[in-house]
């Protein structure tokens, strides 16, 4: 067990151009407060996923009124630390979200109005018991400077707060197999306290409060011998005595979720779905009131003035869940055009565009005909993110710059010879054939299958195809 502590040093405009407007004004004075959300591990988690390590809300800062014409200074901050207690081991790697909120104190109907000014997030490695770590994060034009640390609550010590220390029973040395507790040399490392009732013969623990079974034993307290008659549901290691697989403890065996939480297995561990009023990795943190800030994403907490009464979160538009921790799926509306892929990042929607398209909603066709010229009298045709030229007779290629060989397709029938001409092609027909492509036979009596040839053009003369 221990406490994560966060100290906010400053919140104000970041360096560079485009200083933000002050969030408060003479007409609308306001004050700031902060919320921190902690999650175990370094996984890329959505902003709305539960704060499994815990969350905390700061006190309200001093009331601030902007001085007309003055740039936004560093804004006055709340006093004190934000403290997030954790009951289990400190994970060593964690993700954080720090939100800066503005409480407007004007003549609001129905109380003060809250709005999110900035949200920063990060993933860090941190050993418990170490010094304060300093950090600077930027959100848009705002900059947040802060420090943080994790410290163990006695009797826990160590980088994960899993070792327990007790005062020495003898002044000179610790008991068998137990080391002195650095840096508290006058105390001794205590044996781990397993889950109450965990079998001392068949169970063991690597963290306080757990009960892991030796091979051949099962149950929440490792008191139930595994049946070797059927060898069903193989999960654990092979038993040396029976030669078959015995079910080892699954992550949800014995339901590690407290306070009526329901357990579901995940690929690497388990996940507890907690009833309202409880949170934490195992639903072990209880007595949540509105003062603890259980409503995320700007949700308004109602009721829950004391730990015995339930609170209700009234979620702002776009959020849902008992703690407003889930975001409505806005991508269902398919706002991205031209086959773009929609991504809901929480603070904004983003579109990942297909090749040939750009813009916030993939609305711009990069390869359209704007500014594109087709040479030699060709015309541009748009479509499907690409442009093509419909070329005039005698030209080809992407931009109609290449001279087409009209004879390439062997257009002259019945052995006629093809000649390229500036306006197209000319077929010189073999004896007995006529027509633009030599497609018509000449009848033996001299008449053709077509109306008579134009005056001055004898059958067998080259026919020009225009």
């Amino acid at each position: 067990a221990g406490v994560f502590e966060l100290q906010i040093h400053s919140f104000g405009p970041g360096p560079g151009p485009g200083a933000p407007r002050s969030p408060c004004s003479a007409r609308l004075p306001c004050r700031l407060f902060f919320r921190v959300c902690l999650k175990p591990g370094l996984s890329e988690e959505a902003a709305e996923s539960p704060c499994a390590l815990g969350a905390a809300l700061s006190a309200r800062g001093p009331v601030y009124t902007e001085q007309p014409g003055a740039p936004a200074p560093d804004l006055p901050l709340p006093d004190g630390l934000l403290q997030v207690p954790f009951r289990d081991a400190w994970p060593g790697t964690f993700s954080f979200i720090i939100e800066t909120w503005r409480e407007e104190l004007g003549d609001q109907i129905g109380g003060p109005a809250w709005s999110l000014l900035a949200r920063v997030a990060g993933r860090r490695r941190l050993a418990a018991g170490g010094p304060w770590a300093r950090d600077i994060q930027r959100a848009g034009a705002w900059e947040l400077r802060f420090s943080y640390r994790a410290r163990c609550e006695p009797p826990a010590v160590g980088t994960a707060c899993t070792r327990l220390c007790r005062p020495r029973s003898a002044p000179s040395r610790c008991g068998p197999g137990l080391r002195p507790c650095a840096p508290l040399e006058d105390e001794c490392e205590a044996p781990l306290v397993c889950r109450a009732g965990c079998s001392p013969e068949h169970g063991f623990c690597e963290q306080p409060g757990e009960c892991r079974c030796l091979e051949g034993w099962t149950g929440p307290l490792c008191t139930v011998p595994v049946s070797t008659s059927s060898c069903l549901s193989p999960r654990g290691p092979s038993s040396a005595t029976t030669g078959c697989l015995v079910p080892g403890p699954g992550p949800c065996d014995g339901n590690p979720c407290a306070n009526g939480g329901s357990c579901s297995e995940t690929p690497r561990s388990f996940e507890c779905t907690c009833p309202r009023g409880f949170y934490g990795l195992r639903c072990e943190v209880s007595g949540v009131t509105c003062a603890d800030g259980p409503c995320f994403n700007g949700g308004l907490c109602v009721g829950g003035a004391d730990p015995d009464s339930a609170y209700i979160c009234h979620c702002p538009p776009g959020f849902q869940g008992s703690n407003c921790e889930k975001r409505v799926d806005r991508c269902s509306l398919q706002p991205c055009r031209n086959g773009g892929l929609c991504l809901d990042l929480g603070h904004a929607l983003r579109c990942r565009c297909r090749a040939g398209f750009a813009g916030p909603r993939c609305e711009h066709d990069l390869d359209d005909c704007a500014g594109r010229a087709c040479a030699n009298g060709g015309t541009c045709v748009e479509g499907g993110g690409a442009h093509r030229c419909s070329c005039a007779l005698g030209f080809g290629g992407r931009d109609c710059r290449e001279r087409a060989d009209p004879c390439a397709a062997r257009p002259c029938a019945h052995g006629g010879r093809c000649y390229a001409h500036f306006s197209g092609l000319v077929c010189a027909c073999a004896p007995g054939y006529m027509g633009a492509r030599c497609e018509f036979p000449v009848h033996p009596d001299g008449a053709s299958a077509l109306p008579a040839a134009p005056p001055g053009l004898r059958p067998g003369d080259p026919q020009r195809y225009l």
């Epitope: 398919q334 706002p335 929607l349």
Partner: nanobody, 119 residues
Framework: EVQLVESGGGEVQPGGSLRLSCAAS????????IGWYRQAPGKQRDWVAG???????TYAESVKGRFTISRDNAKNTVYLQMSSLRAEDTAVYYC?????????????WGQGTLVTVKP
């Protein structure tokens, strides 16, 4: 700032019909995508139907063949014609829109209108 105002909700018997309207108002905006979501008591807010960014009408499986979405661009209004209503259609229906204001896109929600289907 764009306002979305829903209307047309009410109580109806199973098998009955209702027509919801969503009027968008504001200055200097254009609608990219617009549609309807619904939230039944104690449930998640789910998408129902909409006009995509490409202007295509799309529907959730649960309402296909029963609900029809339409729009009047001149009035910046979208409609949801609901027929063959069932008890499970009882929910607060919200209008949602992805709107272009200047060069940026913003998402807006309406306040919702309640539809109750009961015998």
């Amino acid at each position: 700032e764009v306002q979305l105002v829903e209307s047309g909700g009410g109580e109806v018997q199973p098998g009955g019909s209702l027509r919801l309207s969503c009027a968008a108002s504001g200055s200097d905006f254009s609608i990219n995508a617009i549609g309807w979501y619904r939230q039944a008591p104690g449930k998640q807010r789910d998408w129902v139907a909409g006009f995509t960014g490409d202007g295509v009408t799309t529907y959730a499986e649960s309402v296909k063949g029963r609900f029809t979405i339409s729009r009047d661009n001149a009035k910046n209004t979208v409609y949801l014609q609901m027929s063959s209503l069932r008890a499970e259609d009882t929910a607060v229906y919200y209008c949602a829109a992805d709107v272009k204001i200047g060069g940026d896109y913003e998402w807006f929600w309406g306040q919702g209108t309640l539809v109750t289907v009961k015998p």
